[in-house]
């Protein structure tokens, strides 16, 4: 039968866990990204924020995975889903928050928001 969407989300969670566990030096040289509201349109917003980090191989797979959860093309400098752009946080903190929230969605069966 149809594959539940949770399998794809599990892959994303595993990648985020991998990033947080393998972090030795400051992630992406301490680059800062816009914080996002972890609500509706979260995946597109997360991608729009992270896409502005370039040259950081550690998060390239995450950026790519997030594109499969967002219906539209996301380019650097695009902020259609980032409703509020008032706080910047380190990429490492961003990834930790994203991991925490995706785990929460996974537990409650809300795979795609």
């Amino acid at each position: 039968g149809p594959v539940p969407p949770s399998t794809a989300l599990r892959e994303l969670i595993e990648e985020l866990v991998n990033i947080t566990q393998n972090q030795k030096a400051p992630l992406c040289n301490g680059s800062m990204v816009w914080s996002i509201n972890l609500t509706a349109g979260m995946y597109c917003a997360a991608l729009e924020s992270l896409i502005n980090v370039s040259g950081c191989s550690a998060i390239e797979k995450t950026q790519r995975m997030l594109s499969g959860f967002c219906p539209h093309k996301v380019s650097a400098g695009q902020f259609s889903s980032l409703h509020v752009r008032d706080t910047k946080i380190e990429v490492a903190h961003f990834i930790t928050k994203l991991l925490s929230y995706t785990k929460q969605l996974f537990r409650h069966g809300q795979q795609f928001n």
């Epitope: 594959v3 790519r64 499969g68």
Partner: antibody, heavy 123, light 107 residues
């Protein structure tokens, strides 16, 4: 290591049927969308069909719609392509391809390709 | 149906830059991918998301996409880059491949 191994190709008469299989290994098969892409002798690449990894949606090229059926068995890590009412123009190498994740898998990029299996439709 | 058009062939001298274009209506609104295929081999993804390189793809491969045209650029072209190149995009629930470009490295 991610691997895709196609089988089931061969010579078939016009109007005949064939079922291609693709055995996948080295990744969580059920998570990923999968596609079939073909290449006629001396010609370019042509996408045939895709099966999403989330939600079970299927997609087909107009040239095969109604004749080909894509399916997958996640317990066996295998992708299939049932080809009916075959025509001479279906003669090609058929590649199994690992696609992307999520409901919008097509935003990801076709990462891994099998070696291909040859289908020849001729009388 | 959606179409992606590429030049049939591009010739380049070793060490020079080869540019391959891919044209399609509002292609810049979509993600473009590029594949390299050598004779008798399966295609290999060299660019995804317009300009991103998968791991293992040399830095001399780069891509861009805006308006109606995506471009694959090979800087400092080497003999091993001689191959067929295909662009690809998704439109209306179908993947579309470009017509293909044969890159010949002279000499």
């Amino acid at each position: 290591e991610v691997q895709l191994l196609e089988s089931g190709g061969g010579l078939v008469q016009p109007g005949g049927s064939l079922r291609l299989s693709c055995a996948a290994s080295g990744f969580t098969f059920s998570s990923y969308a999968m596609s079939w892409v073909r290449q006629a002798p001396g010609k370019g690449l042509e996408w045939v069909s895709a099966f999403s990894g989330s939600g079970g949606s299927t997609y087909y090229a107009d040239s095969v719609k109604g004749r080909f059926t894509i399916s997958r068995d996640n317990s066996k890590n295998t992708l299939y392509l049932q080809m009916n009412s075959l025509r001479a123009e279906d003669t090609a190498v058929y590649y199994c391809v690992q696609d992307g994740l999520g409901p919008y898998f097509y935003n990801y990029g076709m990462d891994v390709w099998g070696q291909g299996t040859t289908v020849t439709v001729s009388s | 149906s959606y179409e992606l058009t590429q030049p049939p062939s591009v010739s380049v001298s070793p060490g020079q830059t080869a540019s391959i274009t891919c044209s399609g209506d509002k292609l810049g609104d979509k993600y473009a991918c590029w594949f390299q295929q050598k004779p008798g081999q399966s295609p290999v993804l060299v660019i995804y998301h317009d300009s991103k390189r998968p791991s293992g793809i040399p830095e001399r491969f780069s891509g861009s996409n805006s308006g109606d045209t995506a471009t694959l650029t090979i800087s400092g072209t080497q003999a091993m880059d001689e191959a067929d190149y295909y662009c690809q995009a998704w439109d209306s629930s179908t993947y579309v491949f470009g017509t293909g470009t044969k890159v010949t490295v002279l000499g």
